[in-house]
């Protein structure tokens, strides 16, 4: 019996087609993805093949103005229109709190939304009961397939799920649910979830009875053969894991932003064992036409967005590099721009002894979600900025000891190279890392811009001195593992909305040209 699994993950509000780097579409003939194009391909496969499931592994929420304006209603509407069969909850589904998940998505979705390792407690338990499920059994042709969901247990550090949801260890939570499916004589089981490729592989290895793992969160691109676009494969598609009980378990993910549609064909024997698996992500490029009915619906929904966000704020004459490949690995000029805007927003010349009360900014690279291409006449709109800074956070003022900052910069590179979001972009700081040293001892130079000076210059950080720093509220609250900031901050004052800070700066500057200028170095 053959099953075709179509899958998406980390779509992050890319309902419309995008450019190749998943920022706003500029040249339509070279654009990719979007739900109208996705629908064309999905329908084509549904017509050609008998047993097809369309699955999403989480993080539909957050990423463009679509989410800023529609707050999840757009996700439910268009996923319903595409007839998704199931979705796993991702961490970003909690960005607007639990209410922002329940009302627009959980109550409106016509497909099951899954997570076996999220347990509700307190008053929320009855409110959310039945709105998401640990698993669902789906009839497919003459067979049934069990889909069991999971969500990153780091979600409380990455989003806003509140205090009444407990995120359990994925493997511990999944095993009894898979065992339950086995008692129902369900012998074809897909684990669908959002915990990253490393956890996906562990689930394949450790959870008895899981036949296939469809993942998300790490934006992992897998491909067999010559890749069709810029993404470099992290391994073959599917990635085969040998389970502890000796089975070959295919693990897949489909990059992110709706650029690809994952396409996996699985052959099962009559006992539900995987005999073979093969496929590849399908690049949703302009050779695939956009479905006219979905496109018309998109255009209808777009009207509200156009009114909201298309006014030009200013211009850039350089590429604003907000890619993960840059901002999570090295100094990127988008990080520099945002930090400069954050400092600019906090200029308060209230004392003749100080040119300003604060000179430093830190910004987690994972919070920068999109680049901006200067080739669109250099125009920068609110919409562009909403794709860069989609989380609706604030840029806050904190007071920290130098020793806390040093810990934060060590944390920035403690697991460098895995494209994790904690890598810090900076302003008013010069840092030098030596990655040959062991984690926790990699910062070899940390200089900070003086404030009590008429001519600003960089001086070595003093461990016992108290410094003011501008940073995202996400970091002030210990996000991305920066627990030391949350635990050790001496003062925390809430600031202005992130996009507003940057848009105001761009409007003020009119033309911007941020550079990579040696704020972050590696020795």
């Amino acid at each position: 019996w053959e099953l075709t699994i179509l899958h998406t993950n980390d779509v992050h509000s890319r309902l419309e087609q995008t450019s190749e780097d998943s920022s706003k579409c500029v040249n339509a003939s070279r654009c990719m993805g979007g739900v109208a194009r996705l629908f064309t391909k999905v329908q084509q496969i549904r017509r050609a093949e008998p047993n097809v499931l369309l699955l999403d592994a989480g993080d539909q929420y957050q990423g463009t103005i679509w989410f800023t304006v529609y707050k999840g209603a757009e996700v439910a509407h268009f996923m319903n229109a595409l007839r998704y069969d199931a979705m796993a909850l991702g961490n970003h589904e909690f960005d607007n709190g639990v209410e922002g998940l329940i009302e627009p998505l959980l109550k409106e979705a016509k497909f099951p939304i899954l997570s076996a390792n999220i347990k509700a407690k307190g008053p929320l338990a009855s409110q959310i009961s039945g709105l998401y499920l640990p698993y669902k059994v789906l009839p497919v042709g003459d067979e049934v397939v069990g889909i069991v969901g999971y969500t990153s247990k780091e979600t409380p550090f990455l989003s806003n799920p509140g205090t009444n949801l407990v995120f359990e260890d994925e493997i511990t939570a999944l095993q009894p649910e898979v065992d339950k499916l086995k008692t129902l004589n369900v012998n074809k089981i897909i684990a669908l979830g959002h915990s990253g490729f490393e956890m996906d592989k562990l689930i394949a290895q450790k959870v008895r009875g899981v036949d296939v793992v469809v993942g998300g969160h790490s934006n992992t691109f897998l491909y067999t053969g010559n890749p069709p676009s810029k993404e470099v494969p992290a391994g073959k598609y599917p990635f085969i894991v040998t389970s502890d009980d000796g089975r070959k378990v295919p693990v897949v993910q489909a990059y992110a932003f709706g650029k690809y549609l994952g396409y996996l064909k699985i052959e099962f024997d009559e006992r539900g064992n995987v005999i073979s698996s093969h496929g590849n992500p399908i690049l949703l490029n302009s050779s695939i036409p956009e479905d006219p009915s979905i496109k018309a619906d998109i255009n209808k929904w777009r009207i509200k967005l156009d009114n909201y966000s298309t006014q030009e704020l200013g211009k850039t004459i350089v590429y604003l590099d907000g890619s993960s490949q840059s901002c999570r690995f090295r100094e990127c000029n988008m990080g520099n721009l945002i930090c400069d805007a954050m400092i600019n927003n906090n200029l308060r010349h209230t004392d003749e002894m100080f040119w300003n009360h604060v000179s430093m900014c830190i910004l987690n690279g994972g919070g920068i979600r999109s680049p901006i291409d200067e080739r669109n006449n250099g125009t920068i709109t609110w919409e562009n900025l909403a794709a860069v800074l989609p989380f609706g956070g604030t840029f806050d003022l904190v007071q920290l000891k130098g020793s806390t900052l040093k810990k934060a910069f060590e944390h920035s590179v403690h697991r460098y190279g895995q494209s994790t979001g904690e890598f810090l972009q900076v302003g008013g700081i010069h840092v030098v890392y030596d990655l040959s040293r062991k984690p926790g001892d990699r910062v070899v130079k940390l200089d900070v811009l003086c404030t009590k000076c008429r001519v600003p210059s960089y001086d070595p950080l003093k461990m016992d001195e108290v410094y003011k720093v501008i940073l995202p509220n996400f970091l002030a609250n210990g996000g991305d593992g920066f627990q030391m900031i949350k635990d050790e901050l001496l003062r925390h004052d809430s600031g202005d909305q992130d996009i507003n800070v940057v848009s105001t700066y761009i409007s003020k500057m009119k033309v911007i040209y941020p550079a990579v200028e040696g704020r972050i170095k590696f020795s």
Epitope: S129, K136, V137, P139, V144, P176, L181, L184, N185
Partner: antibody, heavy 119, light 107 residues
Framework: QVQLVQSGAEVKKPGASVKVSCKAS????????MHWVRQAPGQGLEWMGA????????SYAQKFQGRVTMTVDTSTSTVYMELSSLRSEDTAVYYC????????????WGQGTLVTVSS | DIQMTQSPSSLSASVGDRVTITCKAS??????LAWYQQKPGKAPKLLLS???SLETGVPSRFSGSGSGTDYTLTISSLQPEDFATYYC?????????FGGGTKVEIK
């Protein structure tokens, strides 16, 4: 609205068989399990088994294995439960009840069919 | 098989009373618990599933709680139409099993 309509009461002799029907309407018949639950006079509820009309898959409680047969006719959205080798302790009201394939609580029930086994 | 032990087997109460019925599973059932109400000569009626999830049309005076092996059905203020027999049912492991029932009678 969802309705499950069962066949009428039966009186059977020990050793005989009985076949009870349950006709479903008001929902997609092939996407839910149909369960059979019985209740002896003055007693509690006892699950006998279930059939999934989508693919004919059947689960029986061990106690009834070999004596119970469940079948489905998708053209008429009807499920049948046949119990053979009847004994007096099989005297009970037999209910069909709808349940999700994956979460087997019973949200809709038939009106019940009284089967009396008496010599 | 998972045994479901319901207590008490019967209770007498007055209109307006708060009534609590407990159900203990012989092993963990991961919150896969339903409660039913049955009146004489009628089929059972589903009240709650997933321990706490109230079926559409079921009055809010009915509520469920519990986890692991121990579960409770509470009727916050007993009404005349609530005099009936109540059953719990586990749907974690085949065969699905019911508690022995609790008959709620008028005092």
């Amino acid at each position: 609205q969802v309705q499950l309509v069962q066949s009428g009461a039966e009186v059977k002799k020990p050793g005989a068989s009985v076949k009870v029907s349950c006709k479903a309407s008001g929902y997609t018949f092939t996407t839910y399990n149909m369960h059979w639950v019985r209740q002896a006079p003055g007693q509690g509820l006892e699950w006998m088994g279930a059939i999934f009309p989508g693919n004919g898959h059947i689960s029986y409680a061990q106690k009834f294995q070999g004596r119970v047969t469940m079948t489905v006719d998708t053209s008429t959205s009807t499920v049948y439960m046949e119990l053979s080798s009847l004994r007096s302790e099989d005297t009970a009201v037999y209910y069909c009840a709808r349940g999700d394939y994956d979460e087997s609580y019973f949200d809709y029930w038939g009106q019940g069919t009284l089967v009396t086994v008496s010599s | 098989d998972i045994q479901m032990t319901q207590s008490p087997s019967s209770l007498s109460a007055s209109v307006g009373d708060r009534v609590t019925i407990t159900c203990k599973a012989s092993e963990g059932i991961y919150n896969r618990l339903a409660w039913y109400q049955q009146k004489p000569g009628k089929a059972p009626k589903l009240l709650l599933s997933g321990v706490i999830s109230l079926e559409t049309g079921v009055p809010s005076r009915f509520s469920g709680s519990g986890s692991g092996t121990d579960y409770t059905l509470t009727i916050s203020s007993l009404q005349p139409e609530d005099f009936a027999t109540y059953y719990c049912q586990q749907y974690w492991s085949i065969p699905w099993t019911f508690g022995g029932g609790t008959k709620v009678e008028i005092k």
